[in-house]
């Protein structure tokens, strides 16, 4: 019997300081560029090595960005979202959604080293 894949969804506020070359990440998504099926949200597609986001360490590829400096990213064209980040100022507050994949074993299964066995 195969395990079931579940997702643990958490939200976090991440405050970044714009570095010499900006925020240091790429995005996909938007109403005109749906990267995830049936979801026009904005997602992190790449984090630049040694950029501001990478040095902070909390933002991850695959994270969904819900807001920038309190401004909701719902129903935005892709380029409008890009421009929002580029014009967000020196101190940038991101509300992000992390989606962690969790592998669940079959019901009733106990691992070999399970102390409750």
């Amino acid at each position: 019997m195969n395990g079931r894949v579940d997702y643990l969804v958490t939200e976090e506020e991440i405050n970044l300081t714009r570095g010499p070359s900006g925020l240091g990440f790429n995005i996909v998504g938007g109403t005109d560029q749906q990267y995830v099926s049936n979801d026009s949200g904005i997602y992190v597609s790449r984090i630049k090595e040694n950029g501001a986001a990478a040095l902070d360490g909390r933002l991850q590829e695959g994270d969904k960005i819900l807001s920038v400096n309190g401004q909701d990213l719902k129903n935005l064209l892709h380029q409008d979202a890009v421009d929002l980040f580029r014009n967000a100022g020196y101190a940038v507050s991101l509300r992000v959604q992390h989606r962690l994949q969790v592998q669940n074993g079959p019901i009733g299964h106990r691992g070999e080293g399970d102390p409750s066995g």
Partner: nanobody
Amino acid sequence: DVQLVESGGGLVQAGGSLRLSCAASGRTFSSYTMGWFRQAPGLERDFVAEISWNGGSTGYADSVKGRFTISRDNAKNTVYLQMNSLKPQDTAVYYCAAVIGSPTDSSDYRSSLDYDYWGQGTQVTVS
């Protein structure tokens, strides 16, 4: 992943024109930001031009503004660099590059570290 193959390089006289092409393989080409870089012997790979996923936004190095034009055809999975008024200092190997998504940083700061996928390059020589 994306594979990139450049073509269109060659020898041209100063003041002449060339059009470089970069053919990309990959199903999600339209989600990629595409760029051109160049590298002269003994020098670093320098940013030349960049185009957004749908062609709506472009950026250029100061040294090529007004002379070079970047464009793309997502139906053909191809990006182009039209180079006019070529100068001897434009002589270099020209590389096509791709990265998934759109950088949230202005192209004023673009470097080779911003791109993940590269072609093998095509030589442009201006005499």
